[in-house]
């Protein structure tokens, strides 16, 4: 069964900067990745970035840079410049649309006790649905 993992990492040098790492574990090719915060995409979350293998990437503040790390994983850099939600208490969700598997989504957040530079374990936490 395909799985999605999510890591949220606070940057050691810049305490207002965070990076979300997401990956897809499974066969098939990724057709679209959507990153949201505050909840799943389409279920109360706010779309932060979309990444497409051919069409490119888009991100919305406070997201600063979305990029592919591998063919099945992405990263999203965020900068907390007084936006309406503090990252430390926020859930980030990644949804991978894959052919022929469909859509798979998981969420993660920064552990409350995280030191700068440490990240949440890359444990897949499947939520809600696999479309």
């Amino acid at each position: 069964t395909p799985e999605v993992w999510v890591q949220v990492q606070m940057e050691a040098t810049e305490l207002s900067s965070f990076t979300v790492h997401c990956g897809f574990l499974g066969p098939g090719s990724i057709s679209l990745v959507t990153v949201s915060w505050g909840g799943p995409d389409g279920a109360g979350g706010t779309k932060l970035a979309v990444l497409h293998p051919e069409l490119g990437t888009r991100q919305w503040a406070p997201a600063r840079q979305a990029r592919w790390e591998t063919q099945s994983s992405i990263s999203l850099a965020l900068e907390d410049s007084g936006a309406s939600s503090p990252f430390a208490n926020t859930t980030f969700c990644c949804k991978f649309a894959s052919f022929p598997e469909g859509s798979w989504e998981s969420c993660g957040s920064l552990p409350p006790s995280s030191d700068p530079g440490l990240s949440a374990p890359p444990t897949p936490v499947p939520i809600l649905r696999a479309d």
Epitope: G38, G39, D41, G42, G44, G45, T46, K47, V50, H52, L55, G56, T57, R58, W60, A61, R64, S84
Partner: antibody, heavy 119, light 106 residues
């Protein structure tokens, strides 16, 4: 087809407030950011801010913080912009525009709402 | 905030000719620039996004290029319906429009 339909022209007095609407149709309203843009007569375009209807998340151009308040009503797929403490500087055409994401920013626009502030 | 300097502010060209408009950003905008056409009394119309990607239904007479801080937009084989004001927009970091270029036909 995608359409954004804005409310009609407004004539208001200085110091008052006005609420402009922008009704969306032809797409999933909660999936796309709605932006608002100001255009003074004979002048260029100024981005005011955005709202993400799926979560009510807003982000404002610093210049318009305290002047504009963006809201949505999901049930009617309508975005609103409240402009307060109006002065003659607020007289302009205001546009709503959908952000198409990977299809491009501001890919569909409303027809514009003319606001005249005069005593 | 990123500033966008668009030039020229106006230009006049002949039917069948070619015009080029430039926009310079105050910092690198990573190709996140779009171009719009606006006719009097109407809302803007998206022509090009991500520097050079033509919107569906837009004629190939319209084109865009650039990298880093510098972007350009061209119209070739000018037609009467191209009379309009053209704006660039950076969307790398929030949104900033250029000042506009009013195109007239000689």
């Amino acid at each position: 087809q995608v359409q954004l339909q804005q409310s009609g022209p407004e004539l208001v007095k200085p110091g008052a407030s006005v609420k402009i609407s922008c009704r969306s149709s032809g797409y999933t309203f909660t999936d796309y950011y709605i932006n608002w843009v100001k255009q003074r007569p004979g002048q260029g375009l100024e981005w005011i801010g955005w709202i993400f209807p799926g979560s009510d998340y807003t982000y404002y151009n610093e210049k318009f913080k305290g002047k504009a308040t963006l809201t949505v009503d999901k049930s009617s797929t309508t975005a609103y912009m409240l402009l307060s403490s109006l002065t003659s500087e607020d007289s302009a055409v205001y546009f709503c525009a959908r952000d198409g994401g990977l299809r491009g920013p501001f890919d569909y626009w409303g027809q514009g709402t003319t606001l005249t502030v005069s005593s | 905030d990123i500033q966008m300097t668009q030039s020229p502010s106006s230009l006049s060209a002949s039917l069948g000719g070619k015009v080029t408009i430039t926009c310079k950003a105050s910092q690198d905008i990573n190709k996140y620039i779009a171009w719009y056409q606006q006719k009097p009394g109407k809302g803007p119309r998206l022509l090009i996004h991500y520097t050079s990607t033509l919107q569906p239904g837009i004629p190939s007479r319209f084109s865009g290029s650039g990298s880093g801080r510098n972007s350009s937009f061209s119209i070739s084989n000018l037609e009467p319906e191209d009379i309009a004001t053209y704006y660039c927009l950076q969307y790398d970091n929030l949104h900033t429009f250029g000042g506009g270029t009013k195109l007239e036909i000689k």
